[in-house]
Every structure is written in C-alpha cells, then in structure tokens.
Interface confidence: low
C-alpha cells in the first residue's frame, strides 16, 4: 500500500484584489478512508476555509467534482481576493473514527500573498536651487505594492549612483507597502542638462521596471560670469560700454546700468543665446556720450540673477584732460 | 458561547484619539474577522473596516482611511479600534461585529457597543 | 460605493400581520458564483444589531422560521409571515459584495 502525500506544489501564490486564487492539493492514494478539508494557519487557532461536506462556503469552489469515488485532486478556488484573505492554506486530510474523523496528514502549505504593482515612482528635488558642487537630495516615492519586496536604484544621465538611504514602510505584515529613497547629488556645472532617475522594480511588473525622473535643471543654479569692455565709436565722442553676462541658469536675469551711482537703465534678460550645455550667455551694451563729461565717470553694471544678492562690477570712463579743459571753459 | 465584551463610554475633545477595544471569548480568536460599524444618535450603521486577528491584516473603508487603526492583541483576544483627529461627527455607538470570511461573511455576532462622545 | 435603499422607512402592524420590507441596491449583488451577497439585520430598541439573513435566503442559525429572505440582482424582500410584539425594531439591509453598506434603516412598529 503506498504510503499517502498530500501535494500542494505552490509554495507562494501571488494574487491580485478582486482575482480568483487557485489552491492546489492532490493525494496519491485513496487511503485512509476520509475527508480532506482545507485550513488557513495552523494550530488550535486555525480557520476552516473549506469542508465538502458540511458548512456554507459560498466564496469557495472545487476544481474537481469530489464526489467521484476514485478522485485524488482537492484543489480549491477562491474567488473574489481581498486583502484579509492573505496567508497560509494548507490542505489537511482526515481518517474516518468514530465518533470523530481523526487528522492523518497536512500538505506542505501554500502561503497566498496580495499581489499589487507599486504606483509610478514619483521623484521631488529639494526646495531650493543650489550652485555647482554642491549636494542636493532627490527623493523617489512609490506606494501601494504587495508583496514587500522590491528593488530601488537611482541614476544620473544613466549611470547608476550609490550614495542613497531607502525605507519600505510598515516593517511589519501589511496589506501593501510604500517605499522613500533619498539620493544624494553632487551638481557640476554642467548639470541644466542633467536628469536623476529613480527605478522601482517589483515581482508584479514582470522584469520591466517603473521610472520616475527629475531634471537637475529645477535643482541647479549657475551663476554667471561677468566681463566688461570699452569701445571708443568712429565718431570719437562717444564709447559703446559692452557688458557680458556669460554661462548663467536658469534665465532669471536683471541689470542695472548706473552712471555715477544714479541708474541710468533697468534691462531684463530676453534674447539670450543658449549654450550646448543649457547654460545662456547675454549681451548688453551702453553708449556714453563722452563729450558733456567733464570729469571721470563711474560706470557700474549690477547684474541680480535669479533672486539672488546682486553682483556689481564698475568700471571708469577716464575723460582726457583737453575735454576736461573745455568742459571747465564751457562752466564759465 | 461566543461573546463579543467592548470597553466602556468615552469622552473626548475634537482633534483627540480614542482606542476601543472589543475582546473576544467563546470561539478560536484567530477563526473570525473583527468588523467596526458604526452608528450616530438616532442615524444608521455606518461599516469602518475590518482586522483579520489571524494574519493582523486591517482592510478600511475609504472615508476612515487615515484616520482609523486597527490592531489586535492574540494574547488577550481583543481587538482594537483607534479613531484620531476626532470631530463633533464623531460622536456615535462603535460596534465591534465578528465575521466568518468563507463560512457565508454575515456579522453573526456583535460586542454591546461603546458610546464616544466628541464634544468641546 | 454601493447605494442600499430601503422601503418603507416606517412600518406600522398589527400582531399576527404579515410585514414585508423591500431593499434595492444601486448594483447587482449576485456573484458569479451564484450567491446574492446580501444580509439583513435587525437592532431592537437599545440594543445591537443581529443577524437575521444572509446571502439573500439563509436564516441565520436560533432566528424564527416566520422570517424569510428572497430576492436576485437588485431587489430584495425581507417577509415576517405573522408579526409579533418582540419584532419591533429597525430593519436593515446590507450589501456585503464590496465594501460593506446598509440601507437607511426600517422602523417596525407594532399598530
């Protein structure tokens, strides 16, 4: 007589909300002479999900039809998943006794899990823009995932970064998880054309991961370089004051022209020219009349970018000593 | 018998917590789900969530979300129900009720109920 | 969410009467596995609620046979084949298919 195993092939189900979940048992004999049913958990506290024949379990279907008299598969199907119905079902067969059956033998256990895909990771910058070479922190949040486990990685322009801190909340049992990860991320100057990626990878996505993705653009901010130029014009008496603002972001630029401390002229950045590296660069010009000058003029340019503390550069307008002459003349 | 013994009235402030707790006697603890409904001053019954206490799995019904928890202690048989950021709304008869998820999932058995009154 | 409503919401009789009230949800609660995912209970007066049907026909175990549950799909009857004084209370239904809803409520009173 061969010696009865309860089969239960599937160590762990994977089920979504709302499916059907098939359990499945098979025996390889018909002996002993009694029923099989089917509990969730063990011990003295366990639940009774199924019994052929008695109780009313109207969310619980046989398979195969167990009243043929020589069937061996008592796989069961749920329907209708919802999250409380997670954890072990393990199928239970019973030796007929009097006046009770008498439990012979448990099959290994199938532990149902919920299966729920993880929400697309959404990936944040930090509050406020920062300057090369400084550390800015991206976080990446995806929720709603079962079960826990669950791969994040980050990435900058592709290649994959390893300064980051993840948590997958609750650590205990849920019914689904949430993850936050927090990279951490030296901006270059070079970086308005950068982008960070987080990317989750999860059993219920079948190998083809969610992204979520930043631009470092929303991150960076580059202060510009500033070069000032004098240029005397054909006609003598007057001289083009050529004020360039160069590799700037993001494109939120004010200049002041002041003359002696008094401004002259308010501009506001518009045709800008674009670098390759998303940086601008921006040109602007002042012409002074140098014939009604009778003394040295103090020429400032003050360039406010993006907020920040203006930067001011001056330069002099020396007036030749023969103008200075007949401007003195011309005051008499 | 089965028995569903919930502890008694209380009386909070708006913006507090307060936990109920339901113990169970009678049956194997771990064989019933632990439903929450339940009923404001002469209005209906309103169902809150459930706690399986065997796997200790809560499922919320969507308007409590965030605001309910749910926990269960095997030890002790009960089960607990906390309501936060409670509201003059609030103030209701919380029933604790016992379901057989695949038997037929009636609650067949309820606790005597606890009367929280939110009033500043 | 599944939208229980009851008819009527007030319901005089006289013991010995029969009394019927109706349910209708805004949904079907027939499951493909053929059960009407539907309950009803009844709170007496300073009391809990308890079980009197579930899925749609099936008295719950110690409630008198004079109560019987019928009804598919949409619409449901509760029937109290001959009303008795400790019968009054109010009656609802619930629908248990999704998350869990109950109709507003029907107040048996005894004439």
């Known amino acids: 007589e061969e010696e009865l195993q309860m089969i239960q092939p599937e160590k762990l189900l994977l089920v979504a909300v709302g499916e059907s979940a098939t359990l499945n048992c098979t025996v390889t004999s018909l002996l002993p002479v009694g029923p099989v049913l089917w509990f969730r958990g063990v011990g003295p506290g366990r639940e009774l999900i199924y019994n052929q024949k008695e109780g009313h379990f109207p969310r619980v279907t046989t398979v195969s039809d167990l009243t043929k008299r020589n069937n061996m598969d008592f796989s069961i199907r749920i329907s209708s998943i919802t999250p409380a119905d997670a954890g072990t079902y393990y199928c239970v067969k019973f030796r007929k006794g009097s006046p009770e059956n008498v439990e012979f033998k448990s099959g290994p256990g199938t532990e149902m899990a919920l299966r729920a895909k993880p929400s697309a990771p959404v990936v944040s910058g930090p509050a406020a823009r920062a300057t090369p070479e400084h550390t800015v922190s991206f976080t990446c949040k995806s929720h709603g995932f079962s079960p826990r486990d669950i791969t994040l990685k980050w990435f900058k322009n592709g290649n994959e970064l390893s300064d980051f801190q993840t948590n997958v909340d609750p650590a205990g049992q849920s019914v689904s998880y949430s993850i936050r990860s927090t990279a951490r991320v030296v901006l270059a100057p070079w970086d308005v054309r950068s982008q960070v990626t987080c990317e989750v990878a999860h059993v219920t996505l079948q190998g083809d991961p969610l992204r979520g993705t930043a631009n470092l653009s929303e991150a960076i901010r580059v202060p510009p370089t500033l070069e000032v130029t004098q240029q005397p014009m054909r006609a003598g008496n007057q001289v083009n004051i050529t004020y360039q603002v160069r590799n700037f972001y993001p494109q939120n630029l004010q200049l002041t022209w002041l003359e002696n401390g008094n401004v002259c002229r308010t501009e506001t950045a518009s045709t800008l020219t674009e670098n390759k590296d998303g940086t601008y660069n921006w040109t602007s010009w002042l012409l002074v009349n140098t014939s009604d000058q009778r003394d040295d003029v103090v020429l400032t340019c003050q360039v406010k970018h993006d907020g920040q503390l203006a930067v001011n550069k001056s330069l002099v307008l020396e007036v030749s000593a023969h103008q200075k002459d007949q401007s003195s003349d011309a005051t008499h | 018998q089965v028995q569903l013994v919930q502890s008694g009235a209380e009386v909070k402030k708006p913006g507090a917590s307060v936990k109920v707790s339901c113990k169970a006697s009678?049956?194997?603890?771990?064989?019933?789900?632990i439903n929450w409904v339940r009923q404001a001053p002469g209005q209906g019954l309103e169902w809150m969530g459930i706690s399986n206490p065997s796997g200790g799995s809560t499922y919320y019904a969507q308007k409590f979300q965030g605001r309910v928890t749910m926990t269960r202690d095997t030890s002790t048989s009960t089960v607990y129900m906390e309501l936060s950021s409670l509201r003059s709304e609030d103030t209701a008869v919380y029933y604790c009720a016992s379901s057989r998820r695949y038997w037929n999932g009636a609650f067949d058995y309820w606790g005597q109920g606890t009367l929280v009154t939110v009033s500043s | 969410d599944i939208v229980m409503t009851q008819s009527p919401l007030s319901l005089p009789v006289t013991p010995g009467e029969p009394a019927s009230i109706s349910c209708r949800s805004s949904?079907?609660?027939?499951?493909?596995?053929?059960?009407?995912?539907l309950d009803w209970y009844l709170q007496k007066p300073g009391q809990s609620p308890q079980l009197l049907i579930y899925l749609g026909s099936s008295r719950a175990s110690g409630v008198p046979d004079r109560f019987s549950g019928s009804g598919s799909g949409t619409d449901f009857t509760l029937k109290i084949s001959r009303v008795e004084a400790e019968d009054v209370g109010v009656y609802y239904c619930?629908?248990?298919?999704?998350?869990?809803?109950f109709g507003q409520g029907t107040r048996l009173e005894i004439k």
């Open positions: 619930m629908q248990a298919l999704q998350t869990p809803t």
């Open positions: 009678g049956y194997t603890f771990t064989s019933h789900d």
């Open positions: 949904q079907s609660l027939l499951h493909s596995n053929g059960y009407n995912y």
